[in-house]
């Protein structure tokens, strides 16, 4: 059956933790991505930002997991959910910021 939202969010958090803990060299060779507003539509925005990073196996699972939270199909170069595209940050910082935000949501029991 379908994975409960709480389980899916927990698994996404744990994957982001794995990425952060296992980071040796610069994540995705220091690739830069658009920073996002961690508000409504965050999952699609995060996917739209990260999907533009290619050839980085470390975040492929995260990309797949985020697609499960986003109701529409996302492809590279698509920015419908990225309302503000003014700042680029390293993927490592993006992952760290996303992880913290998701941990807060999870602790408060906000799964959707």
């Amino acid at each position: 059956g379908p994975v409960p939202p709480s389980t899916a969010l927990r698994e996404l958090i744990e994957e982001l933790v794995n990425i952060t803990q296992n980071q040796k060299a610069p994540l995705c060779n220091g690739s830069m991505v658009w920073s996002i507003n961690l508000t409504a539509g965050m999952y699609c925005a995060a996917l739209e930002s990260l999907i533009n990073v290619s050839g980085c196996s470390a975040i492929e699972k995260t990309q797949r997991m985020l697609s499960g939270f986003c109701p529409h199909k996302v492809s590279a170069g698509q920015f419908s959910s990225l309302h503000v595209r003014d700042t680029k940050i390293e993927v490592a910082q993006f992952v760290k910021d996303l992880l913290l935000h998701l941990k807060k949501l999870f602790r408060e029991g906000q799964f959707n």
Epitope: T20, K103, F106, R107
Partner: antibody, heavy 120, light 107 residues
């Protein structure tokens, strides 16, 4: 070397406001979360709230209306404020560092604690 | 809130004994459980996090197991310095909550 140290009054009167400061060293407040916990004499540990590394805060809903947590990163200090103190708030108050890079929240370093007595 | 229930509340044991403390969560907390040791007048000290991961510097005689709602802390061979009170803590959902402790005393 990671250290945390609580400071503040040892005695407060009922209805007064308690202000405790946690001064940390050996880590940055912008990289780690700082949690507050209390323990009444001979009783269980109770989580109060957290100052997240990004400056956001979360609280125990039971005490949320009475608590504020703030920080001064330049001084490496986190401040807990609790209003309308009552004798039942008599406890040892601890600040602790959160393990942070983990999926769960746990406390890997603790201050020595400060016993606060509420009495008129 | 997630309630954490420890048992026993106290136990008497001898040096060299194998000691087991259990912690029951009122709902599923995955493996988001930590164990602490506290001695009189001191702050708690982290022993184990994520159910079974030993904190740096903690002796290997301490181990943790379990998942979901049932968890166990085991001390394989009790040492004189292990006489203390032990607490479990869930780090799954706010408010973070603790068990009320198991006091390990000398028999």
């Amino acid at each position: 070397q990671v250290t945390l140290k609580e400071s503040g009054p040892v005695l407060v009167k009922p209805t007064e406001t308690l202000t405790l400061t946690c001064t940390v060293s050996g880590f940055s407040l912008t990289n780690y979360h700082v949690q507050w916990i209390r323990q009444p004499p001979g009783k269980c540990l109770e989580w109060l709230g957290v100052m997240w590394s990004d400056g956001d805060t979360s609280f125990n809903s039971v005490l949320k209306s009475r608590l504020t947590i703030s920080r001064d990163t330049s001084k490496s200090q986190v401040v807990l404020t609790m209003t309308n103190m009552d004798p039942v708030d008599t406890a040892t108050y601890y600040c602790a560092r959160d393990g942070t890079i983990a999926a769960m929240d746990y406390f890997d370093y603790w201050g020595q604690g400060t016993l606060v007595t509420v009495s008129s | 809130d997630i309630q954490m229930t420890q048992s026993p509340s106290s136990l008497s044991a001898s040096v060299g004994d194998r000691v087991t403390i259990t912690c029951l969560a009122s709902e599923d907390i995955s493996n988001y459980l930590a164990w602490y040791q506290q001695k009189p007048g001191k702050a708690p000290k982290l022993l184990i996090y994520h159910t079974s991961r030993l904190q740096d510097g903690v002796p290997s005689r301490f181990s943790g197991s379990g998942s979901g709602t049932d968890f166990t802390l085991t001390i394989s061979s009790l040492q004189p310095e292990d006489f203390a009170t032990y607490y479990c803590q869930q780090g799954y959902r706010f408010p973070l909550t603790f068990g009320c402790g198991t006091k390990v005393e000398i028999k």
